[in-house]
Amino acid sequence: QDSTSDLIPAPPLSKVPLQQNFQDNQFQGKWYVVGLAGNAILREDKDPQKMYATIYELKEDKSYNVTSVLFRKKKCDYWIRTFVPGCQPGEFTLGNIKSYPGLTSYLVRVVSTNYNQHAMVFFKKVSQNREYFKITLYGRTKELTSELKENFIRFSKSLGLPENHIVFPVPIDQCIDG
């Protein structure tokens, strides 16, 4: 995490694409976080970020149950939240936001996906009056083509993030398989 007080400002939303004709049922299932970029993400060469996985499960009300599983301190950590559909397909907000202290807004926007291989998702939140944003590159597998990774780097840079704010988590087997 970036501990500095000067965060790179979040981009105007008009610079963030939204996947057209988003199919919520096809987006379900497990996604590996192959790439991660954000104004509070910093590349740590001594302690590289480990890959984690996020599972999207569609509920009857068309919200997603979203579970991220991380390998931390020799055990599996689970982080569960709800993404509630916004006014546009592919756009979401956080369910029960009042239960997150200091969090005043949360936006999720699916930038692009082909559902069966890769996706890019933009997140923006205001917490303790500070605006954070990140972009995730999701893969249905732990490896994606260099072309997809380069496109992710380009997009992250277009939103103002330099190279040291863009990481490619190291694939692991613990917790995220199965």
Epitope: I8, P9, P11, P12, L13, S14, K15, V16, P17, L18, V84, G86, C87, Q88, E91, T93, L94, I97, S105, Y106, L107, R109, R154, K157, S158, L159, G160, L161, P162
Partner: antibody
Framework: KIQLVQSGPELKKPGETVKISCKAS????????MNWVKQAPGKGLKWMGW????????TYAEEFKGRFAFSLETSATTAFLQINNLKNEDTATYLC???????????WGQGTIVTVSS | DIVMTQSPSSLSVSAGEKVTLSCKSS????????????LAWYQQKPGQPPKLLIY???TRDSGVPDRFTGSGSGADFTLTISSVQAEDLAVYYC?????????FGAGTKLELK
């Protein structure tokens, strides 16, 4: 006082190249994205794309991919638009416009008229 | 891309009249998380660049006279000029500020009767 000052009018022949400048002053140049907008004679506004000043990464609208290039000279707080292999339909006023974090484009250059004619 | 449709394309008015300009988007411009509508209005006078009037559908930019009012939500927006002055004769554009790429309406030309 915040200002965006663009270079003067250009008269070019088809196939030639033009490079327009947009000099920013009165604010921290690297803190705001710069947009380019095309306005053909008597027509409306068409967003061409933008360049992130922090990283220098350009993004182009679909229609403006290929012959168009955005660049920067950060030390001179200047953004550039280059159009290669000019066509008659490139005849227009080109405007630079600064991103606002509140919304929209809050400061605009005066525009540069480019005329393409043989 | 989001299509912005403005009406009417031109309007003849007398000084002091109240004027209402319409802008409709092909998709909602509302972000439910922060309850903001991402729409901007611009004024362009002949031979000049556009000038930002309204952002967030209803917030006047600094220095914009209070006779200009932006309203609406979702996909339906309005710019109202409560009492038109001679200096308001211009073309007015709305702009999708919600998602990539930013798109403009074709404009409404305000003319003097």
């Amino acid at each position: 006082k915040i200002q965006l000052v663009q270079s003067g009018p250009e008269l070019k022949k088809p196939g030639e190249t033009v490079k327009i400048s947009c000099k920013a002053s009165g604010y921290t140049f690297t803190n705001y994205g710069m947009n380019w907008v095309k306005q053909a004679p008597g027509k409306g506004l068409k967003w061409m794309g933008w360049i992130n000043i922090n990283t220098g990464e350009p993004t182009y609208a679909e229609e403006f991919k290929g012959r168009f290039a955005f660049s920067l000279e950060t030390s001179a707080t200047t953004a550039f638009l280059q159009i290669n292999n000019l066509k008659n339909e490139d005849t227009a006023t080109y405007l630079c416009a600064r991103d606002s974090y509140s919304g929209g484009f809050d400061y605009w250059g005066q525009g540069t008229i480019v005329t393409v004619s043989s | 891309d989001i299509v912005m449709t403005q009406s009417p394309s031109s309007l003849s008015v007398s000084a002091g009249e109240k004027v209402t300009l319409s802008c409709k988007s092909s998709q909602s411009l509302l972000i439910s998380g922060d309850q903001k509508n991402y729409l901007a209005w611009y004024q362009q006078k002949p031979g000049q660049p556009p000038k930002l009037l309204i952002y967030g559908a209803s917030t006047r930019d600094s220095g914009v006279p209070d006779r200009f009012t932006g309203s609406g939500s979702g996909a339906d927006f309005t710019l109202t000029i409560s009492s038109v002055q001679a200096e308001d004769l211009a073309v007015y554009y709305c702009q999708n500020d919600h998602s990539f790429p930013p798109t403009f309406g074709a404009g409404t030309k305000l003319e003097l009767k």
